[in-house]
Amino acid sequence: AITEAREEAKPYPLFPGPFPGSLQTDHTPLLSLPHASGYQPALMFSPTQPGRPHTGNVAIPQVTSVESKPLPPLAFKHTVGHIILSEHKGVKFNCSISVPNIYQDTTISWWKDGKELLGAHHAITQFYPDDEVTAIIASFSITSVQRSDNGSYICKMKINNEEIVSDPIYIEVQGLPHFTKQPESMNVTRNTAFNLTCQAVGPPEPVNIFWVQNSSRVNEQPEKSPSVLTVPGLTEMAVFSCEAHNDKGLTVSKGVQINIKAIPSPPTEVSIRNSTAHSILISWVPGFDGYSPFRNCSIQVKEADPLSNGSVMIFNTSALPHLYQIKQLQALANYSIGVSCMNEIGWSAVSPWILASTTEGAPSVAPLNVTVFLNESSDNVDIRWMKPPTKQQDGELVGYRISHVWQSAGISKELLEEVGQNGSRARISVQVHNATCTVRIAAVTRGGVGPFSDPVKIFIPAHGWVDYAPSSTPAPGNADPVLII
């Protein structure tokens, strides 16, 4: 492959000073050393020789020749100092050194940016022996250069525990600009300024940036990378990209969509998951969030009864998990339920309203005005009461449960009676004489048994006593009444 290589006319900043030596245009060594050339023996270096040692590390051997003349310093010859080429091209460069034959086992290693290059690199060392010296040429080739191949390459040779280091060969791989920072998608508040950043690098530098909004250039003249664009605010979604230009051409960043935050869409699919007498568990599918996270939701509950006053109960909850148990509802009632959610911009409209019903519940209050009296002639206890208010029955009454407890001389027994819903009186047989009978009554619906009334006590005398004053549910605040007949 042909190498696109050229030496800079001006010194490269990292390597000041001129870079003598021929430039490479193919894969042959930069310094070819055929035996028949006019190459001077190592002992004959002259100070004016173009290839003389220059800036690399030098080893001065302590060995002398037969004539006892000291050997000259050993150093790598100069080669091209700076190679500039395009990405994906091939390149080959080399180091050369002449080593007196008295030295054995000389090896050359290649280093890049201070690290030895080991393994799968195309490094070849060729030896050209002569009578007194051996010319060694170490070649390094890269078939398709990438940006990661940029850097400073040197050769190292160890002789006599001394290290000889070549001058660096700087490889500069040029290509289209490469983005190190591209604009990011964002969700922004309407008419509020925000920043976008774009950064690209070469080589070659400089890299210049153009900003594009909805396919129109924002800046008519480029700005040096990195560039920050302050967008003065948007009223509708826009797409931004940046163009990075250098001498090799241009690279366009990904286009990013900037969305305008808005109020969310209303939730959809509000559904009833479970109903009890006093609660309804609902779920919903959130609407589009308006490019801003949901903060919380509001459940609105209206009585569906046309005779109700139309007041709305509002329950606030977190946006997750799209589930809410509405509590403190009346039993056996119809409700309209709607859900609305909010983000930082505001509240969504309410979802379509759905109809939901609570189930029957156990009554929430006990029967009222419980009265108990002894009917001695029939040896019965008569009980009368008033049924609880309809609103608080929490369902259709199916009857009552009567608890009567008989206590005398250390004996206590409780009996339960079930009576039908018709009427508001019951008669129970006297179980024990000379005892106290404590009566409590609870209303019953299909939803369950309600609370028991406050206890009413009546004393049942031994046979033959006269009575008949009734015992009643006490007024509030009077505890544990006992009426002794």
């Epitope: 008419n191 129109s216 924002v218 800046n219 008519e220 003249q221 664009l229 302050t230 003065p232 605010g233």
Partner: antibody
Amino acid sequence: QVQLVQSGSELKKPGASVKVSCKASGYTFTNYGMNWVRQAPGQGLEWMGWINTYTGEPTYADDFKGRFVFSLDTSVSTAYLQISSLKAEDTAVYYCARYGHYAWFAYWGQGTLVTVSS
Amino acid sequence: EIVLTQSPDFQSVTPKEKVTITCRASSSVSYMHWYQQKPDQSPKPWIKATSNLASGVPSRFSGSGSGTDFTLTINSLEAEDAATYYCQQWGTKPLTFGQGTKLEIK
């Protein structure tokens, strides 16, 4: 601070040429494009076009192609507008205005009145 | 090219009155800029990119709009606001200006 200072008024005969200058100071001249805007007596503003101060490339609005030439001398941070073959209807105040992002003209010259009369 | 039509062309207003100048574009634009010009002066940058007041512009001025309809509003007119106001669109080349709206103080 940013300043755009334009050359003084010109009285020209029809068919002649005129060159209006706009000297910039207070910023790096080659970082911002320079626009030219015309305002005929008692009329509104008309965008004539702009010149890229980095490359020297001019862009002309359709109505200003032909006799109008934008040029630069970056060594003295100056933009020029040259009008050739002047006509009476070229009588106007010509403004230079610095390009900003979104074609926002944050800085204007004081204007140069060019009068074309025989 | 995008044609910008301002209305009204001329308005005579009493101080403290609210003033609205509209600028309608012949097709949708991204931003509208506004400039104020007084007689024998060069235009002054007034409102940038639809709604951003330039430095030194009193807060009684505001700008709004999107798409094809944009407005400049003066909440409570003062004598120093007498001037001609021009809109200018960004988004489509060539750049174009509105014909101007002249405000006069009664």
